[in-house]
C-alpha cells in the first residue's frame, strides 16, 4: 500500500493522531495515538 503525508489543509484533522494519505484507496486516514479511537481520533478510551 502506497502512503504519503496528508495535504497541509488536513493539519489538525486528526485530533490525537497522525494523518496519512492512502494513495491506492484515495483516502485520508487517522493513525491514532494509543488510547484514542474514532475517525478523527477524537474519542478516548481506557
Amino acid at each position: 500500500v502506497s502512503i504519503t503525508k496528508c495535504n497541509s489543509d488536513m493539519n489538525g484533522y486528526c485530533l490525537h493522531g497522525q494523518c496519512i494519505y492512502l494513495v491506492d484507496m484515495s483516502q485520508n486516514y487517522c493513525r491514532c495515538e494509543v488510547g484514542y479511537t474514532g475517525v478523527r481520533c477524537e474519542h478516548f478510551y481506557l
Epitope: G12, V23, Y29, V39
Partner: antibody
Amino acid sequence: QDQLVQSGAEVKKPGASVKVSCKASGFNIKDTYIQWVRQAPGQGLEWMGRIDPLRRQTKYHEKFEGRVTITADTSTNTAYMELSSLRSEDTAVYYCVRSGREFDFWGQGTLVTVSS
Amino acid sequence: DIQMTQSPSSLSASVGDRVTITCKASQDIHKYIAWYQQKPGQAPRLLIQYTSTLQPGVPSRFSGSGSGTDYTFTISSLQPEDIATYYCLQYDNLRTFGGGTKVEIK
C-alpha cells in the same frame, strides 16, 4: 447513501444577507470539513471558506473575510453559510462540499439572486 | 494564498485530437491537484484527484500528470461529449481553482 441537501433558491435585495443551509445525511459532519464554493453566471469556481464542525474552526478566503460566516450545527448535522452586505456581483450558485476522509462530495447547489 | 494559473482559457480542437491543459501553482502543492469537468447548467464533475488518480467511471482517455508547481491534464482523443469547461483545483493548502479552460469542437 451519503447526501448533502441544500436549501432552496433565494432572491435578495442589495445590502441584505442570505443564509444557505446544507444538511448532511448518511455521514456525520463531525468526521468532515464542509467547504463552500460559489459560481457566478458564466464565471469560474471560487472557494469561499470552510468549517471544521468538530473543532468549530473556520477558514475564509481573504476576499470574503468579514462578510461571510460559516457555521455548523452538529445536533442537526447541518452546515450554514451566511453572506452579508449583498451586491449584484454575489448573484451565483453556492455549493457546499464535503471533504475529509474521502475526496470532495458536492451538494446540489443553491441559486442566490441579488436584485433590486 | 496559493494562486493557480490555468492555460489556455479556451481552445478549439477536432474530434480525435489530443488536448492538453496546464495549471501552474505559485508554490509546491505536493501533487494535491484535482481536475473537474463542468457542462452548462450542471454541477462540476470530478475526473481526477491527487494529480493522476482517475475517478471510477471516468474514461481512460482522461489523464493527469505533474509534480511540484507544474501540472498537466490531457484528453488523449477528444470526443464530442468532452465539450465542457475544465478546472484545476489545488487542495494542498486550503483551496484554489484555476480560471477554467473552455473546450470546443472545431
